[in-house]
Interface confidence: low
């Protein structure tokens, strides 16, 4: 018996061929011997089966001795043995219809689980293998689960259902809702304007929700909410903002925040959360601000940084075009009685300069100038 696999919602064509290459009498019946369709001369006739409005044939092929049964908008319950009667012969075809669906929604938050459920006809024992967009293969039976979805899981999942050495493939588009970056760090000199950007890693027609930026300043004992906002159809509107600092927020995506001045008291870490309408859970992005200040007080030239620096970052003070006078894995360095000239304070990681501040030291009788 020939086995044909079909996909729920698709169209399948079951073939039936006579030895004579001409139009002759044929009938298609199901396993209960109920007629589905057949011919009366050149006319298509239909029986009382449940397939009535979804069954068809190709009259253009009858003259060649081909009498296909076409079933549209397949349903799991269409799985059956179909019998073609032609020339006193019976051709049997077993049709097995499968469906594969994602649990609830195909738009899932980063970290959530994806469950794919296979609908299959009674008596079948299919195996399923799905390949994620990042090349991961997941195997299972009636259900497949992937926990802790990551950004790279966004895209087309290709699932192969195997039954009786036959295969049918499904394609499911999954969108993982996340920020493009889990974390970012901004390095600024004291007094500079700070731009924080929170680009999303997905695009949807309408995006509605609400968000908040909580900030833990290095110098503060507790965190505080710097800004809350609403998002409606990709339009941003600020609900509440602190007076110090007074953040500004862009009205369009990507989410964009401006801090007018980088000051030591603002250095620290923030957590932007975004709750999307009709989704449980929130999107998160961490943002860090490191602020540098170079000062000269009497005979002491000091360079300081505030904020979340890693222990391997190096802070250096050097006179322009000369070797560093002092380099330490510390958050403050200083030089006593500095020579006159342009001094540079450098924050670097493995030789790469992340932040630089210049301060001009004048001969001892004059006042320092900060360019």
């Amino acid at each position: 018996k020939k086995v044909v696999l079909g996909k729920k919602g698709d169209t399948v064509e079951l073939t039936c061929t006579a030895s004579q290459k001409k139009s002759i009498q044929f009938h298609w019946k199901n396993s209960n011997q109920i007629k589905i369709l057949g011919n009366q001369g050149s006319f298509l006739t239909k029986g009382p089966s449940k397939l009535n409005d979804r069954a068809d044939s190709r009259r253009s092929l009858w003259d060649q001795g081909n009498f296909p049964l076409i079933i549209k908008n397949l349903k799991i319950e269409d799985s059956d043995t179909y019998i073609c009667e032609v020339e006193d012969q019976k051709e049997e075809v077993q049709l097995l219809v499968f469906g594969l669906t994602a649990n609830s929604d195909t738009h899932l938050l980063q970290g959530q689980s994806l469950t794919l459920t296979l609908e299959s006809p009674p008596g079948s024992s299919p195996s399923v293998q799905c390949r994620s967009p990042r090349g991961k293969n997941i195997q299972g039976g009636k259900t497949l689960s992937v926990s802790q979805l990551e950004l790279q899981d966004s895209g087309t999942w290709t699932c192969t259902v195997l039954q009786n050495q036959k295969k049918v493939e499904f394609k499911i588009d999954i969108v993982v809702l996340a920020f493009q970056k889990a974390s970012s760090i901004v390095y600024k000199k004291e007094g500079e304007q700070v731009e924080f950007s929170f680009p999303l890693a997905f695009t949807v027609e309408k995006l509605t929700g609400s968000g908040e930026l909580w900030w833990q300043a290095e110098r503060a004992s507790s965190s505080k909410s710097w800004i809350t906002f609403d998002l409606k159809n990709k339009e941003v509107s600020v609900k509440r903002v602190t007076q110090d600092p007074k953040l500004q927020m862009g009205k369009k995506l990507p989410l964009h925040l401006t801090l007018p001045q980088a000051l030591p008291q603002y250095a620290g870490s923030g957590n932007l959360t975004l709750a999307l309408e009709a989704k449980t859970g929130k999107l998160h992005q961490e943002v860090n601000l490191v602020v540098m200040r170079a000062t000269q007080l009497q005979k002491n030239l000091t360079c300081e940084v505030w904020g979340p620096t890693s222990p391997k970052l190096m802070l250096s003070l050097k006179l322009e075009n000369k070797e560093a006078k002092v380099s330490k894995r510390e958050k403050a360095v200083w030089v006593l009685n500095p020579e006159a000239g342009m001094w540079q304070c450098l924050l670097s990681d493995s030789g790469q300069v992340l932040l630089e501040s210049n301060i001009k030291v004048l001969p001892t009788w004059s006042t320092p100038v900060q360019p």
Partner: antibody, heavy 118, light 111 residues
Framework: QVQLQQSGAELAKPGASVKMSCKAS????????MHWVKQRPGQGLEWIGY????????VYLQKFKDKATLTADKSSSTTYMQLSSLTSEDSAVYYC???????????WGQGTLVTVSA | DIVLTPSPASLAVSLGQRATISCRAS??????????MHWYQQKPGQPPKLLIY???NLESGIPARFSGSGSRTDFTLTIDPVEADDVATYYC?????????FGGGTKLEIK
């Protein structure tokens, strides 16, 4: 940049076992499958199997099911392959290869030469 | 398992001419709009190098002289024009389903 650093050459006696390593760097180790490929001298490439480092899930070519064992250590971003009950047929260069996106091994280790000799 | 059969096993081409290598799969390696067939170049003593991924996509850093085409069961790697540096063995590989498989390889020489 992505790098796969394999352990050095192995000389083993018939019946013994060897365990070779492949240390990954330059990417998120748990996000991609790691494959192993065999090449006997003057012969073609033969796929052995892969491991998903995030779960430890493995798939082997049937003929290597009782021969090769793949493991992964997430803390050191290293994949291991152990070959058991060695025979002269196991003398070959073994490569690890990272699968990227939806197909193709864009990154390969330099290979580990295994010589089985009495 | 999907069996990949390359042809020819070896070929000699004059410099500046076109080389065509074929690979036939025992069953379709297509999955909707993707063909999971890849091509590699290997020189003696070196690991293979990915040239073409998913039938027709040129890997970054590979010269545009290399191109790939085909779908379902029949695939072709074309090198045009051939240069002296192209002397190597070329392999096709499918990753449509487990177990992944390689073709036997085609050795390219210069006439």
């Amino acid at each position: 940049q992505v790098q796969l650093q394999q352990s050095g050459a192995e000389l083993a006696k018939p019946g013994a076992s060897v365990k070779m390593s492949c240390k990954a760097s330059g990417y998120t180790f748990t996000n991609y499958l790691m494959h192993w490929v065999k090449q006997r001298p003057g012969q073609g490439l033969e796929w052995i199997g892969y491991i998903d480092p995030s779960t430890g899930y493995t798939v082997y070519l049937q003929k290597f099911k009782d021969k090769a064992t793949l493991t992964a250590d997430k803390s050191s971003s290293t994949t291991y392959m152990q070959l058991s009950s060695l025979t002269s047929e196991d003398s070959a260069v073994y490569y690890c290869a990272k699968e990227g996106g939806i197909g193709g091994f864009a990154y390969w280790g330099q290979g580990t030469l295994v010589t089985v000799s009495a | 398992d999907i069996v990949l059969t390359p042809s020819p096993a070896s070929l000699a081409v004059s410099l500046g001419q076109r080389a065509t290598i074929s690979c036939r799969a025992s069953e379709s390696v297509d999955s909707y709009d993707n063909s999971f067939m890849h091509w590699y170049q290997q020189k003696p003593g070196q690991p293979p190098k990915l040239l073409i991924y998913r039938a027709s996509n040129l890997e970054s850093g590979i010269p545009a002289r290399f191109s790939g085409s085909g779908s379902r069961t029949d695939f072709t790697l074309t090198i045009d024009p051939v240069e002296a540096d192209d002397v190597a063995t070329y392999y096709c590989q499918q990753s449509k389903e487990d177990p992944y498989t390689f073709g036997g390889g085609t050795k390219l020489e210069i006439k």
